[in-house]
């Protein structure tokens, strides 16, 4: 399964025209229309922590 190009969506509430800015440890969750705590990943092949890259199986920092 190849990597897909991410379709970047506006970080806006469906009932608001004001974009939501989140701090570094957060990201925008469209479901709750707000900034939430966001985890980074360790990729299995490198062990590096990064933002999510499409098309890869990933290992969260905090084990499940």
């Amino acid at each position: 399964m190849g990597a897909r190009r991410l379709r970047v969506r506006s970080q806006r509430s469906r009932d608001s025209s004001v974009p939501t800015q989140c701090n570094q440890t957060e990201c925008f969750d469209p479901l709750v229309r707000n900034c939430v705590s966001c985890e980074l990943f360790h990729t299995p092949d490198t062990g590096h922590t990064s933002s999510l890259e499409p098309g890869t199986a990933l290992q969260p920092q905090e084990g499940s």
Epitope: C27, D29, P30, V36, F41, L52, G55
Partner: antibody, heavy 125, light 107 residues
Framework: EVQLVESGGGLVQPGGSLRLSCAAS????????IHWVRQAPGKGLEWVAW????????DYADSVKGRFTISADTSKNTAYLQMNSLRAEDTAVYYC??????????????????WGQGTLVTVSS | DIQMTQSPSSLSASVGDRVTITCRAS??????VAWYQQKPGKAPKLLIF???FLFSGVPSRFSGSGSGTDFTLTISSLQPEDFATYYC?????????FGQGTKVEIK
């Protein structure tokens, strides 16, 4: 270790009330959204409500709106579901779950990664 | 509300088979789909999130694909422990809605 433990289920008559609790450990509920999902006997999953404790945002399924209230006490790291005016069709196992978010270019990519064991609510006369 | 239509509702398969389950959203939900596995009497388990990302600890025989309105969960080689019910769920907009489920049974 992340854990969610529900309690408060039981047998109640139609029109009655119950309060379910979801005690979290291993993470802080204020950093995530907490969801209640139910499953009637032999049926599929039905989302009920969510709360974002950090700001108090909530939302509800149409089937429970006006009857159920979701809340959270961050000092107790616990979420609640107050269920009033219960009906036979509310009979189900009720699960609480945490929504995890991973950073996908500033936007949440996630799902419900931890679930409680479930608590059975039976509405019957 | 966004409707998630899963198909088939049930299927019979043998160990080693390739199994595909589809989920169709009533409107564009980008890639905001998760897939869950549930066994009788147990809570659901997260398999795939954001349409194609394998959750931690999930075997690589599970994969997900799709975007927009059409999504697929594939089990490349069915194992005995994979006989269960599978659900898709959208989280693009509240309320988050589940598909009706697909029961994978032993042939």
């Amino acid at each position: 270790e992340v854990q969610l433990v529900e309690s408060g289920g039981g047998l109640v008559q139609p029109g009655g009330s119950l309060r379910l609790s979801c005690a979290a450990s291993g993470f802080t509920i204020s950093s995530s959204s907490i969801h209640w999902v139910r499953q009637a006997p032999g049926k599929g999953l039905e989302w009920v409500a969510w709360v974002l404790p950090s700001v108090g945002f909530t939302d509800y399924a149409d089937s429970v709106k006006g009857r159920f209230t979701i809340s959270a006490d961050t000092s107790k790291n616990t979420a609640y579901l107050q269920m009033n005016s219960l009906r036979a069709e509310d009979t189900a196992v009720y699960y609480c779950a945490r929504r995890v978010c991973y950073n996908r270019l500033g936007v949440c990519a996630g799902g419900m990664d931890y679930w409680g064991q479930g608590t059975l609510v039976t509405v019957s006369s | 509300d966004i409707q998630m239509t899963q198909s088939p509702s049930s299927l019979s398969a043998s160990v080693g088979d390739r199994v595909t389950i589809t989920c169709r959203a009533s409107e564009d939900i980008s890639s905001s789909v998760a897939w869950y596995q549930q066994k009788p009497g147990k809570a659901p388990k997260l398999l795939i999130f954001s349409a194609s990302f394998l959750f931690s600890g999930v075997p690589s025989r599970f994969s997900g694909s799709g975007s927009g309105t059409d999504f697929t969960l594939t089990i490349s080689s069915l194992q005995p422990e994979d006989f269960a019910t599978y659900y898709c769920q959208q989280s693009e907009v509240s309320p988050p809605t589940f598909g009706q489920g697909t029961k994978v049974e032993i042939k």
